[in-house]
């Protein structure tokens, strides 16, 4: 014959445990129902009556099946350096995490207790190890041939731009400045050449500009990508 299904409360068989979502009440010495997440035990069970559950009040929660007499209080509101990534509901606590540009200096079980701003690497230094949710940025001096001209928690040291002729050599905090060359048209592969910003990175730089043997006028080239100069008639 099939075993009889026991309804809570019931006395467990000697040596056996209560079923899933039930708990053993020491006072009543019975297996009783747990309350579902978002509820708490308003009245504990007896030998003849099961647990009476009630919903959690505002700003309180229970996340698990439980038989607690009171719901847990949600954590305090997130501070200005944090963002609320999970709201306080009857079934879950509020979770605060650090906002962009900050990292968690002191964590708690869920979320962060104390946020701190990510370190910014000053010019001449670049990011060696980026910041994470729980670790600060690590900066390093830019190696010869590389530079960083920003104060930033994300910028790495970048190679100096390649120059045909170096006007101002780069250093750790400044890209090289190039002088454009102006050869005769027969030496160019195409019809017209415009002064053009150039860049990529040097491995090794001496602190002196180069002598330019280029005929005609020379232009200092701006750094970084941009379109050719308007109305220019060539190098």
């Amino acid at each position: 014959l099939p075993a009889q299904v026991a309804f809570t409360p019931y006395a467990p068989e000697p040596g056996s445990t209560c079923r899933l979502r039930e708990y053993y009440d020491q006072t009543a010495q019975m297996c009783c129902s747990k309350c579902s997440p978002g509820q708490h035990a308003k009245v504990f069970c007896t030998k003849t009556s099961d647990t009476v559950c009630d919903s959690c009040e505002d700003s309180t929660y229970t996340q698990l099946w439980n038989w607690v007499p009171e719901c847990l209080s949600c954590g305090s509101r997130c501070s200005s350096d944090q963002v609320e990534t999970q709201a306080c509901t009857r079934e879950q606590n509020r979770i605060c995490t650090c906002r962009p540009g900050w990292y968690c200096a002191l964590s708690k079980q869920e979320g962060c207790r104390l946020c701190a701003p990510l370190r910014k690497c000053r010019p001449g230094f670049g990011v060696a190890r980026p910041g994470t949710e729980t670790s600060d940025v690590v900066c390093k001096p830019c190696a010869p041939g590389t530079f960083s001209n920003t104060t930033s928690s994300t910028d790495i040291c970048r190679p100096h731009q390649i120059c045909n002729v170096v006007a101002i050599p780069g250093n750790a905090s400044m890209d090289a400045v190039c002088t454009s060359t102006s050869p005769t048209r027969s030496m160019a592969p195409g019809a017209v050449h415009l002064p053009q910003p150039v860049s990529t990175r040097s491995q090794h730089t001496q602190p002196t500009p180069e002598p330019s043997t280029a005929p005609s006028t020379s232009f200092l080239l701006p750094m970084g990508p941009s379109p050719p100069a308007e109305g220019s008639t060539g190098d």
Epitope: G170, T181, M187, H193, V198, T200, Q203, E210
Partner: antibody
Framework: EVQLLESGGGLVQPGGSLRLSCAAS????????MHWVRQAPGKGLEWVSA????????YYADSVKGRFTISRDNSKNTLYLQMNSLRAEDTAVYYC?????????????WGQGTLVTVSS | QSVLTQPPSASGTPGQRVTISCTGS?????????VHWYQQLPGTAPKLLIY???QRPSGVPDRFSGSKSGTSASLAISGLRSEDEADYYC???????????FGGGTKLTVL
Amino acid sequence: EVQLLESGGGLVQPGGSLRLSCAASGFTFSSYAMHWVRQAPGKGLEWVSAISGGATTTYYADSVKGRFTISRDNSKNTLYLQMNSLRAEDTAVYYCAKGGTGDPYYFDYWGQGTLVTVSS
Amino acid sequence: QSVLTQPPSASGTPGQRVTISCTGSSSNIGAGYDVHWYQQLPGTAPKLLIYRNNQRPSGVPDRFSGSKSGTSASLAISGLRSEDEADYYCAARDDGLSGPVFGGGTKLTVL
């Protein structure tokens, strides 16, 4: 007419050294960055190294940094690549190339190439 | 693995128009840097085909044209001829690397 002529390639054992040369003519050599670009057998192009026109600044790919040295002699219109601690993966045709006018990130003229074979 | 991505092969019949793509990222093409194209005929050294996205060196037929948009560029060859059978490489400057970066190359076959 712009001409670039490489020489110095050959067979070398792993760990050995080789010096490549590139003789340039037909343009104002000292006004242009010069580059070395290589091509392993059956593979694509890989930029290796560059040097500014006045030879004050040199540039290297990470794969050769510390092993290769680029230099130039503007009085002789010649570009060099000293290759030390050679590895099997350095086997390639090595081309010298002239930086473009106003923008050294393109190569408007190339040499015919010289083959470097690193093998025991 | 090349920094710039090209299809390994392309083909077309004589007279057709073919396009070869070159896809980069925000540190190279997408950073505003120019794209250059090289043609390498079998057994020869590479030759500059297109520079600064769409400029043709003297001597390059106007059948070859280049364009750039966002993080990618393309080379178009119209009126395909048998002598166009070659490897084509794109190249650009990259913010984080010391020199120009190349695509892996596209082998163009004229059927």
